[in-house]
Amino acid sequence: QQAPYWTHPQRMEKKLHAVPAGNTVKFRCPAAGNPTPTIRWLKDGQAFHGENRIGGIRLRHQHWSLVMESVVPSDRGTYTCLVENAVGSIRYNYLLDVLERSPHRPILQAGLPANTTAVVGSDVELLCKVYSDAQPHIQWLKHIVINGSSFGADGFPYVQVLKTADINSSEVEVLYLRNVSAEDAGEYTCLAGNSIGLSYQSAWLTVLPEEDPTWTAAAPEARYTD
């Protein structure tokens, strides 16, 4: 005989679930023991069966899960899974916060990415700071020339996707350019999108030829010459 224990504690590490109103929430407490334990759920310390909840709840005992669809502010609270058998019991608390903030198209920090000047062979980092309620997807684009033109017949620029990423809200997204050459010079765009819309900002990378060692050595004096 064995008291209940968590079989996948790593899946339970996210204690606070802050989700937009209307989304689906799933809490899981996968467990085992001998005899096979039972699971029941509490909300704010009281037995929870979802009878007062519009849309009810889904309890999937074989998955040790509680599912609530279309969450609303009244669903906020502490949800406890209580797993027990004849030998013992264990419990775990999840905190649910339902966000009512108006989701907006991504907001990009002013001045990022910033115009940058680099020397051939050096490394460059372009930064993009994105604020978004809904999880944003980010693309780094380079504006390119096709058949001698930067723009298509529709008047929109030709672009090449360099990198795509899904990031968490308020993270800094970085485009790394290693060992830059003259061909890397040009316009770069950070494009952020979410379910509401797109936002983008651009910057120019200027690539200078490798510095002449003689010129470099003389440079400090040159600064003070009229």
Epitope: H104, A134, V161, N194, G197, L198
Partner: antibody, heavy 124, light 112 residues
Framework: EVQLLESGGGVVQPGRSLRLSCAAS????????MHWVRQAPGKGLEWVAV????????YYADSVKGRFTISRDNSKNTLSLQMNSLRVEDTAIYYC?????????????????WGQGTMVTVSS | DIVMTQTPLSLSVTPGQPASISCRSS???????????VYWYVQKSGQPPQLLIY???NRFSGVPDRFSGSGSRTDFTLKISRVEAEDVGVYYC?????????FGGGTKVEIK
Amino acid sequence: EVQLLESGGGVVQPGRSLRLSCAASGFTFSSYAMHWVRQAPGKGLEWVAVISYDGSNKYYADSVKGRFTISRDNSKNTLSLQMNSLRVEDTAIYYCVRGAGHGFPTGPDGFDIWGQGTMVTVSS
Amino acid sequence: DIVMTQTPLSLSVTPGQPASISCRSSRSLLHSDGKTYVYWYVQKSGQPPQLLIYELSNRFSGVPDRFSGSGSRTDFTLKISRVEAEDVGVYYCMQYVEAPLTFGGGTKVEIK
């Protein structure tokens, strides 16, 4: 040709449920957020809900929160709106609308393509 | 929520004459990326809305150049330089900055 075609409308009693569908064609459906917008007879336009391109984010108007559920099946190019606990004031034409896509916008980033709409009447 | 207030409620115009519709938002629609996310639609009888203008002043493909959009931050205008019979319908402005997306109440344009 880019097209959205709604179906599933009809007459239903208050408190009942209805499921609307929207079939998309002519574009890469899985790359676009999708919206539902409704229009009560003789009235203006009211936004109802949006779902992100992969279904991970959903947002609703306060008037339908907790009663309506937006979902999508990218393998079938289909958008759905499950409407529960229907009220008389939900009576409207429901339009499926294409939202923002991935990639550099060559034109508006969504709300450019609308379906023809499907009529939902909630009446006792 | 952002409230969109449209004026006038209706407009009766002689063919060939100009027409102007105003829309005011309760908050600025100028976004951090420098664009102003106001859209204009026309809805003709028995049809879904059709996009005319996006991002304040960009004409959607296929829209005649007699339609133009202008404004800044919270005050927006749709102008028809010379109204034609086919322009009859209800015109709506919409904000596309945040959810819930909101529409103006509509302006009905008729021909005299």
